[in-house]
């Protein structure tokens, strides 16, 4: 009998609110023995998959997307899902990543702290299910 | 590659099944459509199978045929074809890291209803 | 339910000219759209996807630009390779938008 898979979980480093430039990396996580994971943009036709997954914990696995440099196109909606064989998870709850004009340089401090849950997370819209390559710094830029 | 098999020559009402066979890629990652193409009309939508295992249809399909999926196949099932369902279907493999384009195509596999 | 409203239904151009083909959406779709060509006997091929994005192999001389809900395909520097017909596609299935196609517009090469 096949697993219940529990809902992957999204979070932006160093924050959700990133100055014009900077860099950002989207961390997907889930549990140990995940193949793929695919971060998604809402509206968006594009994606990202990676199979560059890593043991954050025991009981959890997680892979990494990052944008080197951020633009005004890169802020929206993302979410992530994963796929444990011999199926795909649920898709995440959505993470906001707000891009604003930068007043400082790169480490500026006003950034906002990642979460990767929180009232600030739309939820996912289900619906769009049907939607169902990156290392460890891959590069999302075409996430746009 | 994709390769759609199946077609042939059926009476009305004679349900038949087409499949979509995938060859050098992981088919869990992608979406599959199945389009049709009547003797010189244009491409119909017919419906698709997603990469999360969700299945869709056009409005007009619902009811007539059925679409799912393995490992490597993808099958959509016409389940009471009419003379009008005689076409060239074909199936097609969506590109990485867009949802919006499919560049893998079928031959296409030739379905005649006829009494 | 999504239409997809393809114009013109037919057009001639010369060699070395430029044709316009307009897709115009029921409803907003967004980056879900594509362009493909067919030529008779064969199966489609792929040429805009994204709205805009250039596919793999194909020519430059093949443009896409979408504004709002009206989606254009440009030809230029017309080849008689380019003979054949064009359809618009909203592939966004089961989503908000759907899926469908436009009605084709063949293109003749004189």
């Known amino acids: 009998q096949e697993e219940d898979l529990p809902r992957p979980s999204i979070s932006a480093e160093p924050g959700t609110v990133i100055p014009l430039g900077s860099h950002v990396t989207f961390v997907c996580r889930g549990p140990v023995g995940v193949q793929t994971f695919r971060l998604e943009r809402d509206s968006r036709s594009t994606y990202n998959d990676t199979e560059d997954v890593s043991q954050a914990s025991p009981s959890e696995s997680e892979a990494r997307f990052r944008i080197d440099s951020v633009r005004e196109g890169n802020a929206g909606l993302y979410r992530c899902i994963y796929y444990k064989p011999p199926k795909w998870s649920e898709q995440s709850d959505y993470l906001e990543l707000l891009v604003k004009e930068s007043s400082g340089g790169p480490d500026s401090p006003d950034t906002e702290p990642g979460s990767s849950a929180g009232p600030t997370q739309r939820p996912s819209d289900n619906s769009h299910n049907e939607h169902a390559p990156a290392s460890q710094g891959l590069k999302a830029e075409h996430l746009y | 590659a994709v390769k759609e098999s199946g077609g042939r020559l059926v009476t009305p009402g004679t349900p038949l099944t087409l499949t979509c066979t995938a060859s050098?890629?992981?088919?869990?990652?992608?979406?599959i459509q199945w389009v049709r193409q009547a003797p010189g009309k244009g491409l119909e939508y017919i419906g698709a199978?997603?990469?999360?295992?969700y299945t869709y249809y056009a409005s007009w399909a619902k009811g007539r045929v059925t679409i799912s999926r393995t490992s490597t196949t993808v099958d959509l099932k016409m389940t009471s074809p009419t003379t009008e369902d005689t076409a060239t279907y074909f199936c097609?493999?969506?590109?990485?890291?867009?949802?919006?384009?499919?560049?893998?195509w079928g031959p296409g596999t030739l379905v005649t209803v006829s009494s | 339910e999504l239409v997809l409203t393809q114009t013109p239904a037919s057009v001639s151009a010369a060699v070395g000219g430029t044709v316009t083909i307009k897709c115009q959406a029921s409803?907003?779709?967004?980056?879900?759209f594509a362009w493909y060509q067919q030529k008779p006997g064969q199966s489609p091929k792929l040429l805009i996807y994204?709205?805009?994005n250039l596919a793999s192999g194909v020519s430059s001389r093949f443009k896409g630009i979408r504004s709002g809900t009206e989606y254009t395909l440009t030809i230029s520097d017309l080849e008689c390779a380019d003979a054949a017909t064009y359809y618009c596609?909203?592939?966004?299935?089961?989503?908000?938008?759907?899926?469908?196609f436009g009605g084709g517009t063949e293109v003749e090469i004189n």
């Open positions: 097609a493999r969506h590109i990485d890291g867009d949802y919006s384009g499919y560049a893998l």
């Open positions: 596609q909203c592939s966004d299935v089961g989503n908000t938008y759907g899926a469908a």
């Open positions: 199978s997603t990469y999360a295992g």
């Open positions: 050098g890629f992981s088919l869990y990652k992608y979406n």
């Open positions: 409803q907003s779709i967004g980056t879900w």
């Open positions: 994204g709205a805009s």
